[in-house]
């Protein structure tokens, strides 16, 4: 014959434990029902009556099956340098994480207690290791033959362009400037002609096209930002 199914509250057999989603009440000395997530124990069980559960009030929660007399208070609202990635509900606490451009300098069990802005690498320096959710950017000087002319928490150093003839040599914070070696076809009045370098820098996501013979004035214009060290080496 199948064993009788006991309904809560019931006295457990000596040496045995209560079933899943039940707890042993020391006062009643009975196995009693736990309350589901989002609820708490309003009235504890007795020898003759089971636990009475009630819903958590606003701004409070319980995440687990429980028999707590009061729900837990949700954490305070997220600060201006944070975003709420999980709202406060009856079943879960609010989670605040750092907004883009910031990292968690002091974490808590879930989310972040204190956010700090990601370090920006100054010209002549690039992002050696990107920032992660929990670690700051590491800046290092540009290696020989590379440069960065931006102040950025994402830009890396990129190679100097290679010129037939160098007008101004590149350095850690400036690209090389190429000069013309021989007269070329005329351009619009006032335009300054600088030929394409022998080998242009690679674009961020595409292979370098073969050098064009078309004239270019781009080297007198402000340099665009270095390709970003997008994404991050997460923990």
């Amino acid at each position: 014959l199948p064993a009788q199914v006991a309904f809560t509250p019931y006295a457990p057999e000596p040496g045995s434990t209560c079933r899943l989603r039940e707890y042993y009440d020391q006062t009643a000395q009975m196995c009693c029902s736990k309350c589901s997530p989002g609820q708490h124990a309003k009235v504890f069980c007795t020898k003759t009556s089971d636990t009475v559960c009630d819903s958590c009030e606003d701004s409070t929660y319980t995440q687990l099956w429980n028999w707590v007399p009061e729900c837990l208070s949700c954490g305070s609202r997220c600060s201006s340098d944070q975003v709420e990635t999980q709202a406060c509900t009856r079943e879960q606490n609010r989670i605040c994480t750092c907004r883009p451009g910031w990292y968690c300098a002091l974490s808590k069990q879930e989310g972040c207690r204190l956010c700090a802005p990601l370090r920006k690498c100054r010209p002549g320096f690039g992002v050696a290791r990107p920032g992660t959710e929990t670690s700051d950017v590491v800046c290092k000087p540009c290696a020989p033959g590379t440069f960065s002319n931006t102040t950025s928490s994402t830009d890396i150093c990129r190679p100097h362009q290679i010129c037939n003839v160098v007008a101004i040599p590149g350095n850690a914070s400036m690209d090389a400037v190429c000069t013309s070696t021989s007269p070329t076809r005329s351009m619009a009045p006032g335009a300054v002609h600088l030929p394409q370098p022998v080998s242009t820098r690679s674009q961020h996501t595409q292979p370098t096209p073969e050098p064009s013979t078309a004239p270019s004035t781009s080297f007198l214009l402000p340099m665009g930002p270095s390709p970003p060290a997008e994404g991050s080496t997460g923990d």
């Epitope: 690498c121 320096f125 690039g126 992002v127 050696a128 290791r129 990107p130 590491v138 800046c139 290092k140 000087p141 540009c142 290696a143 590379t146 960065s148 890396i156 150093c157 990129r158 690679s202 674009q203 961020h204 996501t205 595409q206 292979p207 390709p227 060290a229 997008e230 994404g231 991050s232 080496t233 997460g234 923990d235």
Partner: antibody
Framework: EVQLVQSGAEVKKPGATVKISCKVS????????LHWVQQAPGKCLEWMGW????????KYGQKFQSRVTITADTSTDTAYMELSSLRSEDTAVYYC???????????WGQGTLVTVSS | DIVMTQSPATLSVSPGERATLSCKAS??????VDWYQQKPGQSPRVLIY???IRYTGIPARFSGSGSGTEFTLTISILQSEDFAVYFC?????????FGCGTKLEIK
């Protein structure tokens, strides 16, 4: 140009500890992050960890975390990698590699062969 | 951990021809992929970083492309000195991981 010169080959017994050095010349060691990479025979390259000699901050690969210690001496521009509790599968060439603001491993040492054998 | 899978394991190509090497990441790594060349008895050296930026001093015949999970290293006109092992590496998340390499050999 930065150059990385590593210490010579080592033969160790299982359970022992090895400490390899990596001397940076041409530039200050603080201009780079220094990584250590393992290349075991017939295996893929494995990243072990890095140190920022500027503030001695380290980051280790989980596989090596309990056994590896990376340090740096800025006065001699030298980084060190110590691997403890050696076992036969640690027989490998160990490389140090310098990481500048390019975000890549710009320059590598010549490698140090560590043989673990009883 | 992010797994970097390189194919083919061995590629036989004649000098002067084009070689295309593939690297696939087990999850999105953005453009955080570098390519390294290693010759027998030598240390690796960087060719391409951030998926497509040719490192300073690297010949124009080497180019990199791709983003997300699929990356390609192309050597447009193979020279005799290009026959070596090529590794890809991702630095999107820790641990930094390498592919097991493609051996480029003379056909």
């Amino acid at each position: 140009e930065v150059q990385l010169v590593q210490s010579g080959a080592e033969v160790k017994k299982p359970g022992a500890t090895v400490k390899i050095s990596c001397k940076v010349s041409g530039y200050s060691i603080t201009d780079y992050l220094l990584h250590w990479v393992q290349q075991a025979p017939g295996k893929c390259l494995e990243w072990m960890g890095w140190i920022d000699p500027e503030d001695a901050k380290t980051k280790y690969g989980q596989k090596f975390q309990s056994r590896v210690t990376i340090t740096a001496d800025t006065s001699t521009d030298t980084a060190y990698m110590e691997l403890s509790s050696l076992r036969s599968e640690d027989t490998a060439v160990y490389y140090c590699a310098a990481n500048s603001g390019t975000g890549t491993m710009d320059a590598w040492g010549q490698g140090t062969l560590v043989t673990v054998s009883s | 951990d992010i797994v970097m899978t390189q194919s083919p394991a061995t590629l036989s190509v004649s000098p002067g021809e084009r070689a295309t090497l593939s690297c696939k990441a087990s999850q999105n790594v953005g453009s955080n992929v570098d390519w390294y060349q290693q010759k027998p008895g030598q240390s690796p050296r960087v060719l391409i970083y951030k998926a497509s930026i040719r490192y300073t001093g690297i010949p124009a015949r080497f180019s990199g492309s791709g983003s997300g999970t699929e990356f390609t290293l192309t050597i447009s006109i193979l020279q005799s000195e290009d026959f070596a092992v090529y590794f890809c590496m991702q630095s999107k998340s820790y641990p930094i991981t390498f592919g097991c390499g493609t051996k480029l050999e003379i056909k």
